[in-house]
């Protein structure tokens, strides 16, 4: 009779975690008499999995009725398989004795455990980054087996190629982890963008797992600033607007500075969201020009998302010399000389005298005709201003001409000394009525821009005012 053989027909078996594994084993003979034992591994530290004769093995059951006398099938089922159960299992026949001795072993069955990867977790950089910068995203998934796994990166549905992936451990293990780092270049349009990590594994049956990260948590779009000045209908008032455009996130602090000092003037503001997810902020400041003796440097200072403040300055001039309105510089050298000032003053004065004469002439003609049209001329001397005599270098001579023409920005000039002349030509919308008023105003008023002090010596100052009303057909 041929000697007993132990047959383990399956060289390998793969089972999903949580399922049961069936390990097949048959013997070719009933002789010699003796029990079957199952071991995981071989060598000195092999682990007993099942002993037909004795012991308690709650997760192991025999597939056939092993207690039957003629039974030659010693296959076992191991329930609730975990990755820790992976290894090579041996079915070993023992010869009955005192003690029982090993007689024959099967060739072994390698059990591998298929375990699903955990949901990928995508994490971005700790600090926000600005457009054009490259940021790194990491994706991690754990606990899968076998080792073979596929990981892909996407940005808004477009596959990324700049990434590096590692599966750990490098060698054999009961379960594995994957770690991937992708590099993403940020653009200004990425506020609504998403980065997706996709993991495919044999256990997922073609339905990959995805982890996402919103670039809104990573990107910082710095604002662009623009400060503009618009005239308002109210006399001697200017509306200065600071437009903070295309920024993200919304966390923003805006401060107005007047000549470097924080403005206490109340400002109105509005926030709007753009289609790309960025925000716009508009803040405006109503400035009373007559309340200032000198040029006013208005600065719109913005602190965005805890970053160093950025600012845009605007020089509010009381001058006839034209100068660009917006400026990023901290201080500006005017560079004009006194000769230019006198020329400008002369031209303005000549213009004003000519206008006055024309107005008076028109009034006289109207009076002679006396055809229902009325005209009036008023000359008055205003009350005396209390003022320090020594402070005459701070004088501001102010002339305002309001004519019904197209919009024109007020030309401004910065002066090298504290004596400033200001010429402004402003227009307001034409009244609905056919009768339009043409209004000429000559006003010479001494203003003081220095901090208010008690004035021991009042100094006379005068104002001339002419008003002409003309019906216009």
């Amino acid at each position: 009779e041929e000697e007993l053989q132990v047959i383990q027909p399956d060289k390998s078996v793969s089972v999903a975690a949580g399922e049961s594994a069936i390990l097949h084993c048959t013997v070719t003979s009933l002789i010699p008499v003796g029990p079957i034992q199952w071991f995981r591994g071989a060598g000195p530290a092999r682990e007993l999995i099942y002993n037909q004769k004795e012991g308690h093995f709650p997760r192991v059951t025999t597939v056939s009725e092993s207690t039957k006398r003629e039974n030659m099938d010693f296959s076992i089922s191991i329930s609730n398989i975990t990755p820790a159960d992976a290894g090579t299992y041996y079915c070993v026949k023992f010869r009955k004795g005192s003690p029982d001795t090993e007689f024959k072993s099967g060739a072994g069955t390698e059990l591998s455990v298929r375990a699903k990867p955990s949901a990928p977790v995508v994490s971005g950089p700790a600090a926000r980054a600005t457009p054009q910068h490259t940021v790194s995203f990491t994706c991690e998934s754990h606990g899968f087996s076998p080792r073979d796994i596929t990981l892909k990166w996407f940005k808004n549905g477009n596959e990324l190629s700049d990434f590096q992936t590692n599966v750990d451990p490098v060698g054999e293990s009961v379960s594995y982890s994957i770690h991937s780092t992708a590099k993403v270049v940020l653009t200004r349009e990425d506020v609504h963008s998403q980065v997706i990590c996709e993991v495919a594994h044999v256990t997922l049956q073609g339905d990959p797992l995805r982890g996402t990260a919103n670039l809104s948590e990573t990107i910082r779009v710095p604002p662009t600033l623009e400060v503009t000045q618009q005239p308002v209908r109210a006399e001697n008032q200017v509306n200065v607007t600071c437009q903070v455009r295309k920024f993200y996130p919304q966390r923003l602090q805006l401060t107005w500075l007047e000549n470097g000092n924080v403005s206490r003037t109340e400002t109105a503001s509005t926030v709007t969201e753009n289609k790309d997810g960025t925000y716009n902020w508009m803040s405006w400041l109503l400035v009373n020009v007559s309340a200032h003796r000198d040029d006013v440097k208005l600065t719109c200072q913005v602190e965005h998302d805890g970053q160093p403040a950025v600012s845009k300055s605007h020089d509010l001039k009381v001058s006839a010399h034209p100068k660009e309105q917006g400026s990023n510089t901290a201080a500006e050298n005017t560079g004009s000389n006194e000769r230019n000032i006198y020329i400008v003053v002369g031209v303005v004065c000549t213009l004003l005298v000519a206008l006055l004469m024309a107005a008076l002439y028109l009034v006289r003609i109207r009076q002679k005709k006396a055809q229902g049209s009325t005209s009036s001329t008023r000359l008055h001397e205003p009350e005396k201003n209390a003022r320090e005599i020594t402070q005459d270098t701070n004088d501001i001579t102010y002339a305002d001409l309001n004519l019904p023409k197209g919009k024109k920005p007020a030309p401004q000039a910065a002066e090298p000394n504290n004596h400033t002349e200001y010429a402004s030509i402003q227009t307001s919308p034409q009244p609905a009525s056919e009768d339009t008023l043409t209004y000429a105003d000559l006003d010479m008023v001494h203003l003081n821009r220095t901090p208010k002090q008690p004035a021991p010596k009042p100094e006379p100052s005068f104002s001339e005012y002419a008003s002409v009303q003309v019906p216009r057909k």
Partner: antibody, heavy 123, light 106 residues
């Protein structure tokens, strides 16, 4: 295919140190334990000990404790045997040999062997 | 555990049947492997678990025994089988090899 490639022969003086490498390929390095076996000229095989490539823990046979050390460079899938303070009795061919069992917690038999590294210790 | 291969040399002829024996100093069950080593080469696994032929090993090689006495049999000796043969136990630490048996042609 599975291969274990060892470093070349070494000629050393007594008292010196030698480090032999065994580079594995064709399988997952950290799945299988690696043993070292010594064979003196014209003599039999002696198991020196093994290293668990997954944990990095090594076990030396009693006869080889002290001057012998096993190490790994997992990223290079390489195992090392280092012998300190060489003597003439260390002249031998040293083999690395791979265990058959994945996730094995002890070596058994050896289906894969390196080609051997001859270390000659001579004054 | 000492593994004793009492025959250091064995003379044989081609197509002969050769049996190489190995004795363990204590019970090792069936935790025995057999290797073949040709001159200048590394050992090659033939048998594990006392009687299981390793993948790719010709079926003229068979292993038997359990406990303390083990035998490797070459049923149809071939010239390429001329080599040293070693037994090894892996029942307990340290793993130990027999001293070897050299097969030579008569």
């Amino acid at each position: 295919q599975i291969q274990l490639v060892q470093s070349g022969p070494e000629l050393k003086k007594p008292g010196e140190t030698v480090k032999i490498s065994c580079r594995a390929s064709g399988y997952t390095f950290t799945t299988y334990g690696m043993s070292w076996v010594k064979q003196a000229p014209g003599k039999g095989l002696r198991w020196m000990g093994w290293i668990n490539t997954y944990s990095g823990v090594s076990t030396c046979a009693d006869d080889f404790k002290g001057r012998f050390a096993f190490s790994l460079e997992t990223s290079a899938t390489t195992a090392y045997l280092q012998i300190h303070n060489l003597t003439n009795e260390d002249t031998a061919t040293y083999f690395c040999a791979r265990d058959p069992h994945s996730y094995g917690n002890s070596p058994a038999w050896f289906p894969y062997w390196g080609q051997g590294t001859l270390v000659t210790v001579s004054a | 555990i000492v593994m004793t291969q009492s025959q250091k040399f064995m003379s044989t002829t081609i197509r002969d049947r050769v049996s190489i024996t190995c004795k363990a100093s204590q019970n090792v069950g069936i935790s025995v492997a057999w290797y073949q080593q040709k001159s200048g080469q590394s050992p090659k696994l033939l048998i594990y678990s006392a009687s299981n032929r390793y993948t790719g090993v010709p079926d003229r090689f068979t292993g038997s025994g359990s406990g303390t006495d083990f035998t490797l049999t070459i049923s149809n000796m071939q010239s390429e089988d001329l080599a040293d043969y070693f037994c090894q136990q892996y029942s307990s630490y340290p793993l130990t090899f027999g001293s070897g048996t050299k097969l030579a042609i008569k």
